[in-house]
């Protein structure tokens, strides 16, 4: 039998990009950290 029309079974979860800056002293500037939230 042919399949009936359905969307993809995979749900889309938006990834969260969280930026943070940490002060590590005037001579080293700032470290920029990046956290990427995975698919829930």
């Amino acid at each position: 039998d042919a399949e009936f029309r359905h969307d993809s079974g995979y749900e889309v979860h938006h990834q969260k990009l969280v930026f943070f800056a940490e002060d590590v002293g005037s001579n080293k500037g700032a470290i920029i950290g990046l956290m990427v939230g995975g698919v829930v």
């Epitope: 039998d1 042919a2 399949e3 009936f4 029309r5 359905h6 969307d7 079974g9």
Partner: antibody, heavy 120, light 112 residues
């Protein structure tokens, strides 16, 4: 709110063509993901799926009836149509239209049904 | 076609009883997208069918939690934990994975 209502001739003679209309409100068949199907039920018997049409005019038919069925839509008038050619007494039934969408992928909304009697 | 076989065809109950309806499909109704499109509808006399359960086990909005669906592949079950008077009617399972979409013959839930 979403409503659907079927209309038809009520009575036909064998060999005539049945024309059914499903008039709906609360959604548009020009909206991506929308679809409407037809289901029938002979009195005191079970349900039989007939045909289905999507917003992009993609159509599906029950193969056992496909040669006799034509589903179509008028998006601007919020209507879906079903034609069944060469009706016989076996086509005597209540005919329902119902909506499903790609995100609400089930028949959540049904019309009240319209009754057809085929008799000579 | 996918044949949907419901048992029993008639189910006499007393109010407050648990009721269980079985639905078996003649082949797997797992869609290629990974979902199983098995639905349950209740039809009362003179009314249109009403959706209870979709995708095997998901209760539709407003459906009491005494209704639950389960199963996989070809074997599915609808359970009503405590039957109330408003639950009486004919229950249909329905698959929308394969064309033609097909209903079971129905199970009549009635009072003993």
């Amino acid at each position: 709110q979403v409503t659907l209502k079927e209309s038809g001739p009520g009575i036909l003679k064998p060999s005539q063509t049945l024309s059914l209309t499903c008039s709906f409100s609360g959604f548009s068949l020009s909206t991506s993901g929308m679809s409407v199907g037809w289901i029938r039920q002979p009195s005191g018997k079970g349900l039989e799926w007939l045909a289905h049409i999507w917003w992009d005019d993609d159509k599906y038919y029950n193969p056992s009836l496909k040669s006799r069925l034509t589903i179509s839509k008028d998006t601007s008038r919020n209507q879906v149509f079903l034609k069944i050619t060469s009706v016989d007494t076996a086509d005597t039934a209540t005919y329902y239209c119902a909506r499903r969408t790609t995100t609400a992928d089930y028949f959540a909304y049904w019309g009240q049904g319209t009754t057809l009697t085929v008799s000579s | 076609d996918v044949l949907m076989t419901q048992t029993p065809l008639s189910l006499p109950v007393s109010l407050g009883d648990q009721a269980s309806i079985s639905c078996r499909s003649s082949q797997s109704i797992v869609h290629s997208n990974g979902n199983t499109y098995l639905e349950w509808y209740l039809q009362k006399p003179g009314q249109s069918p009403k959706l209870l359960i979709y995708k095997v086990s998901n209760r539709f909005s407003g459906v009491p939690d005494r209704f639950s669906g389960s199963g996989s592949g070809t074997d599915f079950t609808l359970k009503i934990s405590r039957v109330e008077a408003e639950d009486l009617g004919i229950y249909y399972c329905f698959q929308s994975s394969h064309v033609p979409l097909t209903f079971g013959a129905g199970t009549k839930l009635e009072l003993k």
